[in-house]
Amino acid sequence: VPRWRQQWSGPGTTKRFPETVLARCVKYTEIHPEMRHVDCQSVWDAFKGAFISKHPCNITEEDYQPLMKLGTQTVPCNKILLWSRIKDLAHQFTQVQRDMFTLEDTLLGYLADDLTWCGEFNTSKINYQSCPDWRKDCSNNPVSVFWKTVSRRFAEAACDVVHVMLNGSRSKIFDKNSTFGSVEVHNLQPEKVQTLEAWVIHGGREDSRDLCQDPTIKELESIISKRNIQFSCKNIYRPDKFLQCVKNPEDSSCTSEI
């Protein structure tokens, strides 16, 4: 008799999830000499241990602590780039500006990027059929709790000027409900961080509006100022040109405002 299985509203675990996590870990530790000491089998065991045999709506940050410990990594605290709803451009930027880091440039972020996973209460099986959706099912699911945990730690580590890339094409350029708005903003440490610098990325070719005056940006400024951190904002009118000038600031096309 087939065992009854909970049907969740979200997509199931990414196929070949264990193999993908293990392969990514091996690749990352080969590329990053400072992480060569990491035992990827232990990393996978700790990752698995965070959600296997547990109810996928009852996951806690505590469940991920063994994984957090194994994945401990020091990135330059003044070279952190946060992002919200504009992941691809943020990653393109750090691929060029190699000394800056998004969360997905760290081991733990790299392992989990774009993946979904969950288990089932009291069985050692991974659920490839469905996983809880944050809105429709529950917020304390394995994926959401993972990203909340690593995002909090990443923000806590930041210092000096922290940069955040925001999507100027969205109706809410700053969204209080995003990971940036609900976790990272509130975990920047005022005793270490002097300024949060927002880069608002324009989507339209001819969009010359000052999106730093957007009401949601003003809301972000207010939240940050109340936390005793300064705030600054810059419009990036031409993201393609911005990336080009990061690659080569001496390029002749970089002699005007970006």
Partner: nanobody, 122 residues
Framework: QVQLQESGGRLVQPGGSLRLSCAAS????????MAWFRQGPGKEREFVAA???????LYADFVKGRFTISRDNAKNTVYLQMNSLKPEDTAVYYC????????????????WGQGTQVTVSS
């Protein structure tokens, strides 16, 4: 290339004020982070303050509340307003530039001025 020229350094009494200027030419000034460093007699060059292309400011702990960095993109100039000066602020003050992002490490700045001497003494 970015050319930088500092000015404004002079002899000043303890407790006094001074405003240093750094005029830039050669590239689009507004795309560059600008910083002030200083080198006292027999000391290493040390970070004082920086301002990014987006106007984010960054200060060394020893100048917080006394010094203010600002920029005027229309004039291609960065300023360092120095108040409540102390004898230990005596140094050659250098202006530096790098693409976009404000950081503390001198090695990360590509362009440097020749420096301007500030002496705090009674």
């Amino acid at each position: 290339q970015v050319q930088l020229q500092e000015s404004g350094g002079r002899l000043v009494q303890p407790g006094g004020s001074l405003r240093l200027s750094c005029a830039a030419s050669g590239r689009t000034f507004s795309n560059y982070a600008m910083a002030w460093f200083r080198q006292g007699p027999g000391k290493e060059r040390e970070f004082v303050a920086a301002i990014s292309a987006a106007d984010s400011t960054l200060y060394a702990d020893f100048v917080k509340g006394r010094f203010t960095i600002s920029r005027d993109n229309a004039k291609n100039t960065v300023y360092l307003q120095m108040n409540s000066l102390k004898p230990e602020d005596t140094a050659v003050y250098y202006c530096a530039a790098r693409w976009w992002i404000a950081v503390r490490a001198p090695a990360e700045y590509n362009y440097w001025g020749q420096g301007t001497q500030v002496t705090v003494s009674s």
